[in-house]
């Protein structure tokens, strides 16, 4: 058993049929010695008396808020949560496996630049009695500070018969060094509590590996005289790290016909313009990627040819 | 050429070669994300690698103030990786394919380090750790780790030279 926060405790349970329960001794936080009784949750039934209460925790029915009283007055509370371990593996019932980029990916994180700011998100089908707490650091043995905000519900989607809820959190490295080569990964830890079930999820990454620039901005076409060619121009997204002479992007320009089956013409360039042939009813799209490190491409920015 | 003690490197040449290094490093180990190498116990392998750190002056302001600190750090790293790529980690079993970009990568590391430090001038170099994995699979894992680490290193070096070429070239 360990303390998650004040008056909230997590009991770690081996979850197999013939596992013995976990013996927990609750102590009433009071100088009083006599006349103390214990209750669970909203029930007024007395579970025991005395300054300590010894319980066996084996099921979710044994978890909850234990309260000690004296003469009708509440003295202290202890909320017990359960963390299940099945076949030596901690349960992951609360969050959905996003399976990208690999199985058992519960947390996904992205950064728009090298400023040390990043966003993580996760999915669940649970709609109520759900709380999240996020902590992060750079490195684990001698951790350096990363400050995370509160996790918020960022999207709701219908998937078949189920509703899916997306939560996200923004974090910022306290003393980020955008130009340095990272040697210690960022660690992100999410505590998830659903009713009386506790679970924790972790992710470890370098900012450089989760970079995904915003799409290029101000995408414009300039027809070239007496030609089917157009000059496409664009700018670095506002959110990208500066100066651009240091934090450079590379770009992919694509000409795509109306039909998805039509052949796509692609051009790669480090410049912020390119000359392409504009076909009727086609569209021109541009996306960006870090020039020197192959992290994710941005989403496409597009304009129609006409 | 960068003469230790103050003169500027051939920024544009360094830029071109460092960008080529980036391309080669990624073609040598393109499978990003397919193998989480940090789960495989890095300690003895990549802790000794020279990293370009915050105080090394490789940020735009640091380069403007005095690029020599940063260039020395980059030079150290290039020599370090050049030695690693020439060691039995890469020359031993399992053999690299004849068309593997590792050979080109090795030569380019050497080329860039010589651009930064001509013969007769010496910056102190870092000792290469004695890594001699016994099993072929350990060697394979070590190669992946070294290449991943090299990708990060050459990305920072390429940024430095691109910025130098754009803002510090005479």
């Amino acid at each position: 058993i360990w303390e998650l926060k004040k008056d909230v405790y997590v009991v770690e349970l081996d979850w197999y049929p013939d596992a013995p329960g976990e013996m927990v001794v609750l102590t009433c936080d009071t100088p009083e010695e006599d006349g103390i009784t214990w209750t669970l949750d909203q029930s007024s039934e007395v579970l025991g008396s005395g300054k300590t209460l010894t319980i066996q925790v084996k099921e979710f029915g044994d978890a909850g808020q234990y309260t000690c009283h004296k003469g009708g007055e509440v003295l202290s509370h202890s909320l017990l949560l359960l963390h299940k371990k099945e076949d030596g593996i901690w349960s992951t019932d609360i969050l959905k496996d996003q399976k990208e980029p690999k199985n058992k990916t519960f947390l996904r994180c992205e950064a728009k630049n090298y400023s040390g700011r990043f966003t993580c998100w996760w999915l669940t089908t649970i709609s109520t009695d759900l709380t999240f707490s996020v902590k992060s650091s750079r490195g684990s043995s001698d951790p350096q500070g990363v400050t995370c905000g509160a996790a918020t519900l960022s999207a709701e989607r219908v998937r078949g018969d189920n509703k899916e809820y997306e939560y996200s959190v923004e974090c910022q490295e306290d003393s980020a060094c955008p130009a340095a080569e990272e040697s210690l990964p960022i660690e992100v830890m999410v505590d998830a509590v659903h009713k009386l079930k506790y679970e924790n999820y972790t992710s470890s990454f370098f900012i450089r590996d989760i970079i995904k620039p915003d799409p290029p901005k101000n995408l414009q076409l300039k027809p070239l005289k007496n030609s089917r060619q157009v000059e496409v121009s664009w700018e670095y997204p506002d959110t990208w790290s500066t100066p651009h002479s240091y934090f450079s992007l590379t770009f992919c320009v694509q000409v795509q016909g109306k039909s998805k089956r039509e052949k796509k013409d692609r051009v790669f360039t480090d410049k912020t313009s390119a000359t392409v042939i504009c076909r009727k009813n086609a569209s021109i799209s541009v996306r960006a990627q870090d020039r020197y490190y192959s992290s994710s491409w941005s989403e496409w920015a597009s304009v129609p040819c006409s | 050429r960068a003469v230790p003690g103050g003169s500027s490197p051939a920024w544009t040449q360094c830029q071109q070669l460092s960008q080529k290094l980036c391309t080669l490093a990624w073609s040598a180990h393109p499978l990003v994300g397919h193998m989480d190498l940090r789960e495989e116990g890095d300690e003895e392998t990549t802790n000794d690698v020279p990293h370009i750190q915050c105080g090394d002056g490789c940020d735009p302001q640091g380069l403007r103030d005095n690029s020599q600190f940063c260039l020395q750090r980059i030079h150290q790293g290039l020599i370090f990786y050049e030695k690693l790529l020439g060691s039995d980690i890469f020359t031993g079993e399992p053999s690299l394919l004849p068309d593997s970009p590792v050979g080109q990568l090795h030569a380019s590391l050497l080329g860039l380090s010589q651009l930064l430090q001509p013969e007769g001038h010496h910056w102190e170099t870092q000792q290469i750790p004695s890594l001699s994995p016994s099993q072929p699979w350990q060697r394979l894992l070590l190669r992946f780790k070294i290449l991943r680490s090299l990708q990060a290193f050459v990305a920072v070096a390429a940024r430095v030279f691109a910025h130098g070429a754009a803002t510090l070239s005479p």
Epitope: P20, L40, S43, L53, T54, G61, G64 | -
Partner: antibody
Framework: EVQLVQSGAEVKKPGESLKISCQSS????????IGWVRQMPGQGLEWIGI????????RYNPMFRGQVTMSVDKSSSTAYLQWSSLKASDTAMYYC????????????WGQGTMVTVSS | EIVLTQSPATLSASPGERATISCRAS??????VAWYQQKPGQAPRSLIY???NLQSGIPARFSGSGSGTDFTLTISSLEPEDFAVYYC?????????FGQGTRLEIK
């Protein structure tokens, strides 16, 4: 006052189905798991299993798994034990009981339902 | 599963006497043992839980002791209404199991 009131005695033929009930009152039904115990004529007590009224999480005695089904209806604070095909060997007194949280033993018992299976 | 063996199977005693019933587990169950009393035609009634804790409303002449594999129910001074069948139960490991019972009869 905590009370568990069970349905009346049943006489059935082999192969028939049956569902007996246990209605709880005097406490918060969803805060306590409900269990069932069998007592064959002249014999001792046998633990069938327990069930959570919150999410219908069940722990069966392997000896009874597949033989009986436990269920609950939260809206009526009622627990059920059912058979799809009775056998003569199912003849027994069946007790429902409330599981004490933080312990696991049964602190309050129903009065029992006698099930007789005979051709 | 854990087997609980009660002894004696039948205990003959007189009102006012001290009665002791033993319960032995086939493996350790900590202190997670309960004792129940059952009178003819009635449902069992909880007496003792966690080996030695008296259930609310049960007279103080009933007491329990033991831990691990050996447990004892003691009735310090028998009253006429105490003559019944007594069962021990372990609730440490599923499936929870009962002893075969001890019949306490009037000598």
């Amino acid at each position: 006052e905590v009370q568990l009131v069970q349905s009346g005695a049943e006489v059935k033929k082999p192969g028939e189905s049956l569902k007996i009930s246990c209605q709880s009152s005097g406490y918060t039904f969803t805060s306590y798991w409900i269990g069932w115990v069998r007592q064959m004529p002249g014999q001792g007590l046998e633990w069938i299993g327990i069930m959570s009224p919150v999410d219908s999480d069940i722990r069966y005695n392997p000896m009874f798994r597949g033989q009986v089904t436990m269920s609950v209806d939260k809206s009526s604070s009622t627990a059920y034990l059912q058979w799809s095909s009775l056998k003569a060997s199912d003849t027994a007194m069946y007790y429902c009981a409330r599981r004490r949280p933080g312990q696991g033993y049964f602190d309050f018992w129903g009065q029992g339902t006698m099930v007789t299976v005979s051709s | 599963e854990i087997v609980l063996t009660q002894s004696p199977a039948t205990l003959s005693a007189s009102p006012g006497e001290r009665a002791t019933i033993s319960c032995r587990a086939s493996q350790s169950v900590g202190t997670w043992v309960a004792w129940y009393q059952q009178k003819p035609g009635q449902a069992p009634r909880s007496l003792i839980y966690a080996a030695s804790n008296l259930q609310s409303g049960i007279p103080a002449r009933f007491s329990g002791s033991g831990s691990g594999t050996d447990f004892t129910l003691t009735i310090s001074s028998l009253e006429p209404e105490d003559f019944a069948v007594y069962y021990c139960q372990q609730y440490n490991i599923y499936p929870y199991t009962f002893g075969q019972g001890t019949r306490l009869e009037i000598k």
